[in-house]
């Protein structure tokens, strides 16, 4: 057991241009408060699990009123640490979410209004008992500076708070095989006491009172060898004589969820779905009002001005649950078509489409001329895994939307001058050349390289390229 401690040093505009507007004004004075959410392991910040390691809410900071014309300074902060107690071992790696909330103190109907100013998240490695770690995180134009540490609560010690300490029985040294408890040199490390009867050969424990089995052994005391050959089912006959796998107590046995919460098993543990008014890992936190900021993940709290009246969390897209603590797996809907890959960005769902497809759900076949007209009289040509537009004269671009300059490619050879014309281009050829693009030299004897000059056309006449 132990406590995670968070000290906020400052919250204010970050460096660089685009300083944020002050969140408070003379008309709407406000004050800040913070919420921290901790999850074990290097999970995604917005993973399905709620704040499984715990969450804490700071006190309200001093009331702040913006000075007109002054830039937003570092805002006044609440006093004291945010403390998140943990009952079990400290995991060593953890994810955090720190939210900065604004409480507006103007003439609000129904009491003060809360809004989320900034939200930072990260993943860190941290040994319990170590020094304070400093951190700076940015959220938009805001910057949050803070320190954190994990410390064990006596008698626990160690980087995971799993070793226990006891006062020395002898004044000079600890018992056989036991070390002094740093930093409490006058105490000794206590031997870890497993569950009574736990097999010394096939069982072990990481916490006092537990009995965990080595591979191949099962049963509450790890005395039953596992043999699946004669079992009737995976959770087969639970008798030691058959040597079958005996399911240990399920994580939801005895319902660990308090206050009417319902328990569901997860791959590693259990999860409590709490009734409104309660939250926490086991629904043990109660008497909650909107003032306690019970809505996670930027949910908006409505009602619940006193502990007896219910509050309602209006969840942002992608979250659900009475406290917006559960992430909705929206990609499980499989909205992306034509082999598109679904990405849940939190605020939005995005489909990454395979080549040749487009649209919010990859529903649009770009190779299909039927669904992709070309503008300005262009015609659609399929092929090569993509459609393309063959544009009418005077137009260009992917969809024939751009007015083309027919002279841009300098089509007139041998110094001919190009003129744009409604039906295309016209080349005025330099003396001695003729042809639609002035490509044919006129021979000195008046004959040309052409088999026959078009009737009525003298060499040097402008040639229209149609």
């Amino acid at each position: 057991a132990g406590v995670f401690e968070l000290q906020i040093h400052s919250f204010g505009p970050g460096p660089g241009p685009g300083a944020p507007r002050s969140p408070c004004s003379a008309r709407l004075p406000c004050r800040l408060f913070f919420r921290v959410c901790l999850k074990p392991g290097l999970s995604e910040e917005a993973a399905e699990s709620p704040c499984a390691l715990g969450a804490a809410l700071s006190a309200r900071g001093p009331v702040y009123t913006e000075q007109p014309g002054a830039p937003a300074p570092d805002l006044p902060l609440p006093d004291g640490l945010l403390q998140v107690p943990f009952r079990d071992a400290w995991p060593g790696t953890f994810s955090f979410i720190i939210e900065t909330w604004r409480e507006e103190l103007g003439d609000q109907i129904g009491g003060p209004a809360w809004s989320l100013l900034a939200r930072v998240a990260g993943r860190r490695r941290l040994a319990a008992g170590g020094p304070w770690a400093r951190d700076i995180q940015r959220a938009g134009a805001w910057e949050l500076r803070f320190s954190y540490r994990a410390r064990c609560e006596p008698p626990a010690v160690g980087t995971a708070c799993t070793r226990l300490c006891r006062p020395r029985s002898a004044p000079s040294r600890c018992g056989p095989g036991l070390r002094p408890c740093a930093p409490l040199e006058d105490e000794c490390e206590a031997p870890l006491v497993c569950r009574a009867g736990c097999s010394p050969e096939h069982g072990f424990c990481e916490q006092p009172g537990e009995c965990r089995c080595l591979e191949g052994w099962t049963g509450p005391l790890c005395t039953v060898p596992v043999s699946t050959s004669s079992c009737l089912s995976p959770r087969g006959p639970s008798s030691a004589t058959t040597g079958c796998l005996v399911p240990g107590p399920g994580p939801c046995d005895g319902n660990p969820c308090a206050n009417g919460g319902s328990c569901s098993e997860t791959p590693r543990s259990f999860e409590c779905t709490c009734p409104r008014g309660f939250y926490g890992l086991r629904c043990e936190v109660s008497g909650v009002t909107c003032a306690d900021g019970p809505c996670f993940n930027g949910g908006l709290c409505v009602g619940g001005a006193d502990p007896d009246s219910a509050y309602i969390c209006h969840c942002p897209p992608g979250f659900q649950g009475s406290n917006c603590e559960k992430r909705v797996d929206r990609c499980s809907l499989q909205p992306c078509r034509n082999g598109g890959l679904c990405l849940d960005l939190g605020h939005a769902l995005r489909c990454r489409c395979r080549a040749g497809f487009a649209g919010p759900r990859c529903e649009h076949d770009l190779d299909d001329c039927a669904g992709r007209a070309c503008a300005n009289g262009g015609t659609c040509v399929e092929g090569g895994g993509a459609h393309r537009c063959s544009c009418a004269l005077g137009f260009g671009g992917r969809d024939c939307r751009e007015r083309a300059d027919p002279c841009a490619a300098r089509p007139c050879a041998h110094g001919g001058r190009c003129y744009a014309h409604f039906s295309g281009l016209v080349c005025a050829c330099a003396p001695g050349y003729m042809g639609a693009r002035c490509e044919f030299p006129v021979h000195p004897d008046g004959a040309s390289a052409l088999p026959a000059a078009p009737p009525g056309l003298r060499p040097g006449d402008p040639q229209r390229y149609l």
Partner: antibody, heavy 118, light 112 residues
Framework: EVQLQQSGAELVRPGALVKLSCKAS????????IHWVKQRPELGLEWIGW????????IYDPKFQDKASITADTSSNTAYLHLSSLTSEGTAVYYC???????????WGQGTLVTVSA | DIVMSQSPSSLAVSVGEKVTMRCKSS????????????LAWYQQKPGQSPKLLIY???TRESGVPDRFTGSGSGTDFTLTISSVKAEDLAVYFC????????FGGGTKLEIK
């Protein structure tokens, strides 16, 4: 707060071109498709087309293919609708709306009235 | 193009009554891979922009009262208001987002 703020009303001559804007705020512009919808009195809602601001790809209803062009500027989080060769039939309210893969048109602009008159 | 037809084009009901309006598409909006219907319902009150009510044919948008229910599959869809309130005065549009986007002509709900 998610918002789509559209430009003000326009009075244009027949045959002219008009450019309407739709400025997004409160969300990541590149993660949503922006659609344009036309509404004439008693004629309901007509879809014009969409743009993906992430790559500039635009798709149109064929009947608006020659009349409309949609662009987006990610630096200002703004989508544009260019309407050309306007006739009296172009008189309408034009809305922009945002869509992701989960929600269809979840957020709408307030609309821009375009009046085509000599 | 997928054509969307709505019926009736208008109806007048008293407060507290149940209302049903229909939407029919010219081709199926059910995508077989996820068994979802790519259909939405919108409410447009006088002088306002449309507002999303229902998506995926039956999923109610956050904040929409539970008196609004969407149902149906394939080509036939229904929007039901279980007990009409005065503030429900509006035009209701269905929209397909299966291919391109097309809207129905709308059903105008008037209060007697």
């Amino acid at each position: 707060e998610v918002q789509l703020q559209q430009s003000g009303a326009e009075l244009v001559r027949p045959g002219a071109l008009v450019k309407l804007s739709c400025k997004a705020s409160g969300f990541n512009f590149k993660d949503y498709y922006i659609h344009w919808v036309k509404q004439r009195p008693e004629l309901g809602l007509e879809w014009i087309g969409w743009i993906d601001p992430e790559n500039g790809n635009a798709i149109y209803d064929p009947k608006f293919q020659d009349k409309a062009s949609i662009t987006a500027d990610t630096s200002s989080n703004t989508a544009y609708l260019h309407l050309s060769s306007l006739t009296s039939e172009g008189t309408a309210v034009y809305y922009c709306a945002s869509e992701d893969a989960y929600y269809p048109f979840a957020y709408w602009g307030q609309g821009t009235l375009v009046t085509v008159s000599a | 193009d997928i054509v969307m037809s709505q019926s009736p084009s208008s109806l007048a009901v008293s407060v507290g009554e149940k209302v049903t309006m229909r939407c029919k598409s010219s081709q199926s909006l059910l995508y077989s891979s996820n068994q979802k219907n790519y259909l939405a319902w919108y409410q447009q009150k006088p002088g306002q922009s449309p507002k999303l009510l229902i998506y995926w044919a039956s999923t109610r948008e956050s904040g929409v009262p539970d008196r609004f229910t969407g149902s149906g599959s394939g080509t036939d869809f229904t929007l039901t208001i279980s007990s009409v309130k005065a503030e429900d005065l509006a035009v209701y549009f269905c929209q397909q987002y299966y291919s391109y986007r097309t809207f129905g002509g709308g059903t105008k709900l008037e209060i007697k």
